[in-house]
Interface confidence: medium
């Protein structure tokens, strides 16, 4: 669809005569008839197949034609057509004399024709005017013409329909050739597809309007590039949705079981070395001079009773010092200056001479010891505490401080490792001599049945069209993450494209 435009510029009829040579009375009141038709090698009479147009009287004899309206007529003259412009044409322009006001052909005398010109040729669609001048014996006509497309029609032949739009059906303007030019933020054949926020993950994100980034299930973050871990995941991360990969030192389905008590709680005191020995379990190796489960107790060097023969022990910064009773000397009061005559044996001990009376030996009654029977028997010397328990003298009695996993007066009882119900997900616990063992129910594995090994919902490859499958551990179901262009719970449906424009 387009318009053939003809701009009449100047008509010269100096003598004011008709084509027959007869003069007009009082002058030639001139109007024009235009016929536009298909290309003819020799322009001949016949239907004006592309259209006709007539002007009102534009002037008398010789005159210039104004660019807009003249006596109700239009200049340029418009010859619209509703077909593909063929690129060639024939044009007939007739100048007529109007004796009266009635310009209809049947109202004019046959000799009212002033002049007639006919041209034909090629004409491409375009904005530029072609200037032409036709001269006969008595007249001269100067004019220009062009073909332009109607609104919303484009292309070399005005055959491409395109109307700009910004609605549900598209967001575009039209280029000079009729192709679509998407508005900012839109793409696709009909500019219906929004351009998401820059960096929005291609598979895990989408948008319904430009510069948006909405996340598909299992993904989060401004660009939908962060996976959502399994619900309840405490000290873990994911690389695909619903995973819970434990950080170092943590275990269990939700990474909430502390496997590195040493690092997370630093229980050992006074520079002791900490060793993890299971979930929430540890052992402290004390530096010299310290004792206790957490090495929290400072050892006195006098605790080992190094002074003999009733010597008193005094702690010093660099060790200890023995204060010996009368008759004894030496670092530990081990040397005697007494004999049996001095009655050196205490607590009912019997004295026996040795080396011809140079020294002696005491035979002590039960519960007493020492070279002079001066010491009550140290209840800890016999190492009564079993299983590595630590013996502590407490006045007349003694007590055992047991290692983890043991109890009883002498640490002789093994605490059941199973008492804490360490096996997750209904696993059966078995006490072993050195620890425990879990027998896991179907669907779980690991030292404590903490790893879910249920049937992988993705094993049957339920997703189509190269979609990515994720197993939702909480429901044992799968989620398909569709590539662009596919939809459906299994990505089984291609996205249908809208029908093309009807040209």
């Amino acid at each position: 669809s387009g318009v053939f435009q003809l701009q009449l510029q100047e008509f010269i009829n100096e003598r004011g005569v008709l084509a027959s040579g007869r003069p007009c009375e009082p002058g030639c009141r001139t109007f024009f008839r235009v016929c536009l038709k298909h290309f003819q090698a020799v322009v001949s009479p016949g239907p004006c197949t592309f259209g006709t147009v007539s002007t009102p009287v534009l002037g008398t004899n010789s005159f210039a034609v104004r660019d807009d309206s003249s006596g109700g007529g239009r200049n340029p003259l418009q010859l619209p057509f509703n077909f593909t412009w063929p690129g060639t044409f024939s044009l007939i322009i007739e100048a007529w004399h109007a004796p009266g006001d009635d310009l209809r052909p049947e109202a004019l005398p046959p000799d009212a024709l002033i002049s007639k010109i006919a041209i034909q040729g090629s004409l491409a669609v375009g904005q530029n005017w072609l200037l032409d001048e036709q001269t006969s014996t008595l007249t001269r006509l100067r004019y220009s013409y062009r073909v332009i497309c109607s609104d919303n029609y484009y292309g070399d032949n005005c055959s491409r329909l395109c109307k700009k739009r910004n609605d549900h059906f598209g967001h575009y303007v039209c280029q000079p050739d009729g192709n679509l030019s998407c508005l900012p933020g839109w793409t696709g054949e009909y500019c219906q597809q929004p351009i998401c926020l820059s960096g929005c993950h291609e598979q895990n994100g989408y948008c319904s309007k430009p510069a948006e980034c909405l996340c598909r299930p299992g993904w989060q973050g401004r660009l939908c590039n962060e996976c959502i871990p399994h619900n309840g995941c405490r000290h873990g991360t994911c690389s695909t949705p619903w995973q819970c990969t434990c950080d170092e030192g943590w275990g269990g389905l939700f990474c909430d079981q502390d496997l590195n008590y040493c690092t997370h709680h630093s229980p050992c005191k006074n520079g002791a070395t900490c060793s993890n020995s299971g979930q929430r379990s540890y052992t402290c190796t004390c530096r010299p001079g310290y004792t206790g489960v957490d090495c929290e107790l400072e050892l006195s060097e006098c605790d080992s009773n190094p002074c003999r023969n009733g010597g008193s022990c005094k702690d010093q910064e660099d060790g200890y010092h023995c204060l010996c009773p009368p008759g004894y000397y030496g670092l530990h009061c081990e040397h005697s200056t007494l004999s049996c005559a001095d009655s050196p044996c205490f607590n009912g001990g019997s004295c026996r001479e040795r080396n011809q009376g140079a020294n002696y030996a005491c035979e002590c009654p039960p519960n007493f010891t020492g070279s002079n029977c001066e010491k009550k028997v140290d209840r800890c010397t016999s190492n009564p505490c079993a299983n590595g328990g630590q013996c502590l003298n407490r006045g007349p009695s003694r007590m055992c401080r047991c290692r983890p996993g043991f109890t009883g007066t002498y640490c002789e009882l093994h605490v059941s490792d199973c008492a804490r119900n360490p096996c997750a997900h209904g696993g059966t616990c078995h006490d072993l001599e050195n620890g425990l063992m879990c027998t896991c129910p179907a669907g779980f594995s690991g030292r404590r049945c903490e790893v879910r090994t249920s049937i992988d919902a993705c094993a049957s490859s339920p997703c189509f069209n190269r979609a990515t499958c994720y197993t939702d551990l909480s429901t044992d179901t799968f989620v398909c993450n569709c590539p662009y262009g596919f939809v459906g719970s299994r990505c089984e449906f291609p996205v249908g494209l809208p029908p093309s424009f009807p040209w």
Epitope: K163, R165, N166, D167, H168, F169, G170, Y190, P498, P499, F501, P502
Partner: nanobody, 123 residues
């Protein structure tokens, strides 16, 4: 006043199909766009699919590839073919004329909402 009458809804199992029809009485809608909307309980009404006077189409992302909109101007009717239905498609479906700057605006007496047609998809 123009009456919009929707029909074709019903109860269907997931994966099934339905075809909805909407007829405008007392007017011809050749020169303006028509669309199908839906409203699920507790949710806002949303445009699902639309068709313009030159048969350009629009589909919401959630129905692309499953729903097809078409029109029969001679019968003053617009259709919505719904395939591979999902439980989340359950809603009351209405037809009306959405805004389009390409098409004529629907006349002022057009498009007070009809009764709609209930679509229920069971799993």
């Amino acid at each position: 006043e123009v009456q919009l009458v929707e029909s074709g809804g019903g109860l269907v199992q997931a994966g099934g199909s339905l075809r909805l029809s909407c007829t405008a009485s007392g007017s011809t809608f050749t020169s303006y766009a028509m669309g199908w909307y839906r409203q699920a309980p507790g949710k806002q009404r949303e445009l699902v699919a639309a068709i313009s006077s030159d048969d350009s189409t629009y589909y919401a992302d959630c129905v692309k590839g499953r729903f097809t909109i078409s029109r029969d101007n001679a019968k003053n009717t617009v259709y919505l073919q719904m395939n591979s239905l999902k439980p989340e498609d359950t809603a009351v479906y209405y037809c009306n004329a959405p805004h389009s700057d390409y098409d004529e605006e629907a006349p002022s007496d057009f498009g007070s909402w009809g009764q709609g047609t209930q679509v229920t998809v069971s799993s």
